[in-house]
Amino acid sequence: VPEKSVRWCAVSEHEATKCQSFRDHMKSVLPSNGPSVACVKKASHLDCIRAIAANEADAVTLDAGLVYDAYLAPNNLKPVVAEFYGSKEDPQTFYYAVAVVKKDSDFQMNQLRGRKSCHTGLGRSAGWNIPIGLLYCDLPEPRKPLEKAVANFFSGSCVPCADGTDFPQLCQLCPGCGCSTLNQYFSYSGAFKCLKDGAGDVAFVKHSTIFENLANKADRDQYELLCLDNTRKSVDEYKDCHLARVPSHTVVARSVGGKEDLIWELLNQAQEHFGKDKSKEFQLFSSPHGKDLLFKDSAHGFLKVPPRMDAKMYLGYEYITAIRNLREGTCPEAPTDECKPVKWCALSHHERLKCDEWSVNSAGKIECESAETTEDCIAKIMNGEADAMSLDGGFVYIAGMCGLVPVLAENYNTPNPNCENTAEEGYFAVAVVKSSSDLTWDNLKGKKSCHTAVGRTAGWNIPMGLLYSKINHCRFDEFFSEGCAPGSEKNSSLCKLCMGPSPNLCEPNNKEGYYGYTGAFRCLVEKGDVAFVKHQTVPQNTGGKNPDAWAKNLKEEDYELLCLDGSRKSVQEPANCHLARAPNHAVVARKDKADCVQTLLLDQQRMFGSSVTDCSSNFCLFESKTKDLLFRDDTVCLAKLHDRNTYEKYLGEEYVKAVTNLRKCSTSPLLEACTF
């Protein structure tokens, strides 16, 4: 059956032979209605990429550099299955390219000019492409030929396989630049030895090199890693201090109609029957005909790449930047230490309009990018299409897990002029009911619930975390009879109460009328029994403060708070009747952009922040008539974080623990991708 067939692309006679053996052995173990293998032979991996894009083949396994080629238009392929190395319990699908230095040296990443460098080899990922790609725009012009520019940047190097006649400085630390183990400074261990011997000041290797060469922790402690933010970390902290994370070997397929489920079904069955130590007659991860045929011999198995993970996310911003710099050879005209405009990520149409107004008023210092969901915005910041946005704590957690950092906190209670330097404790997550109802925290089962959105702090993480510890399962849509929790599955009972309009029904953005704090409260007013919101929501939308037709006649005293002890209190008493304290919303950005984002935002709030008194005739950053567009409307200022500059420190141990516990109920495809 053609639709059940996976056409595997082979790039040599030996691969084609192994592919045919793979096909025949799979036929013998799979049912007739299961997936099957067909083999397509092409002259090169690039030809395979083109064949898959043209629907002449379905799958091929590629190194990271070729995954980049596969992702570029017009190919538009995506990673679907990753090879893993190491054990099944601790599978490694990536390695980290790092810059290692001796602890007693005193320079940072931005001070490498004039130092001596040790590389694994010319054109190799960790030893050349990544470090030189990331340093590309700091190299002296002309940058072509590249070897000459690198020779003029460092004061001496060892670059095995370089041309020592044309570029003698690249072989200064290893005469002749030998391209094999006869050169003592060749490859990973050699580059590290070059540093260890004192020949070089920095070695560009992979994270495991140090551990493989220095078994003793005391010896390893003599070395540090250079981080891209111009700090240093210990060699154990490679996950937080690396030049790039590099995928090892990956199966790619078409982004649309790519048969990824079938490919996974096939490879999963293949590893069960023919994986490491499974079968004598055919081995997936070795071959009598040659090395690394179809798959790497060192692979131990396959892992399915999460569906939300496209090639950009899989390769990572640093890796793509490095490779793009090398391939395209283009650098910004502005010096790299000058802040470029900050691209703000706006959620759907209404936020985009406010962002555009901000852009005009900022004289172009702010630019705008849009996405339909918060998770899509976070992904855009990760891959460099956008730079920053302000997020609820639940999304600060997801953004943090995806490598972004908090930059500034929204403050709601501290008056100027102390606001910018004050760390607030947070706001209260509350459960609001109508005063006329007889509901308590203990009899919510079967009631109608209203939530700001799935994954948000007050509207979801806190109430559902508390509920989970009571009911011990994740079927919240069965606990409540119906509700509106934007971001839920469209056919879920937690979308039943949402108002839409239609194509936007239950979408986690402002196009859904019941989205956010104000939306969840409106849901309670019009349809629901309980709303999970922040403690300021009721006062901000009653007593005529919200002029919208649905809200203009509402009275504060018609609503009460549910307390965890089963009692109820006035909305004026959140300090004595709340579900938990919630961390304030915060602005997040990529690490490399954090300083620029902070500087620009502090400058923007001086012009457009809460010191502006007349918002009818001036642009106001923190005002959108209860819609909380871009920032919460009750923001007084954006405040510096001082030492709370990681998502864990910012959110606090207790909240991180609560959200981590709730992860077993997670419906976040982005979180799944970021923790892959």
């Epitope: 149409h349 209404h350 936020e351 309009l353 406010k354 555009d356 107004e357 005009v360 008023n361 004289a363 918002c615 009818s616 005739s617 001036n618 642009f619 106001c620 005002e623 959108s624 008539k625 819609k627 567009l629």
Partner: nanobody, 117 residues
Framework: EVQLVESGGGLVQPGGSLRLSCAAS????????MAWYRQAPGKGLELVSG???????NYRDSVKGRFTISRDNSKNTLYLQMNSLRAEDTAVYYC???????????WGQGTLVTVSS
């Protein structure tokens, strides 16, 4: 109720010029930031240029040096002078004011600009 009426569009050859106008009523024109947007066939709405109440202006990169936005507060009118027009400028052009803070959907009917030889 805010009313925005755009005019001045038409068919023009590449390299040609057009001047769009937008008459606003019911808005607090003189104190609002105003902007021109455009929507090309099958594409999303994009900001072309904006002008604050004090007259400072901003342009998307692709129109810088070719388009000029201006306003006449006494006539409650916004203008967009478009020179050196290109085929990729073909779109329906809309003006908007940002005065309501609801980030409303007050859009006029737009004016079609077609650049073709």
């Amino acid at each position: 109720e805010v009313q925005l009426v755009e005019s001045g569009g038409g068919l023009v050859q590449p390299g040609g010029s057009l001047r769009l106008s937008c008459a606003a009523s019911g808005s607090i024109f003189s104190i609002a930031t105003m902007a021109w947007y455009r929507q090309a066939p099958g594409k999303g709405l994009e900001l072309v240029s904006g002008i604050t109440r004090s007259g400072s202006t901003n342009y998307r990169d692709s129109v810088k040096g070719r388009f000029t936005i201006s306003r006449d507060n006494s006539k409650n009118t916004l203008y967009l002078q478009m020179n050196s027009l290109r085929a990729e400028d073909t779109a329906v052009y809309y003006c908007t004011d940002y005065s309501s803070r609801y980030y409303h959907d007050y859009w006029g009917q737009g004016t079609l600009v077609t650049v073709s030889s």
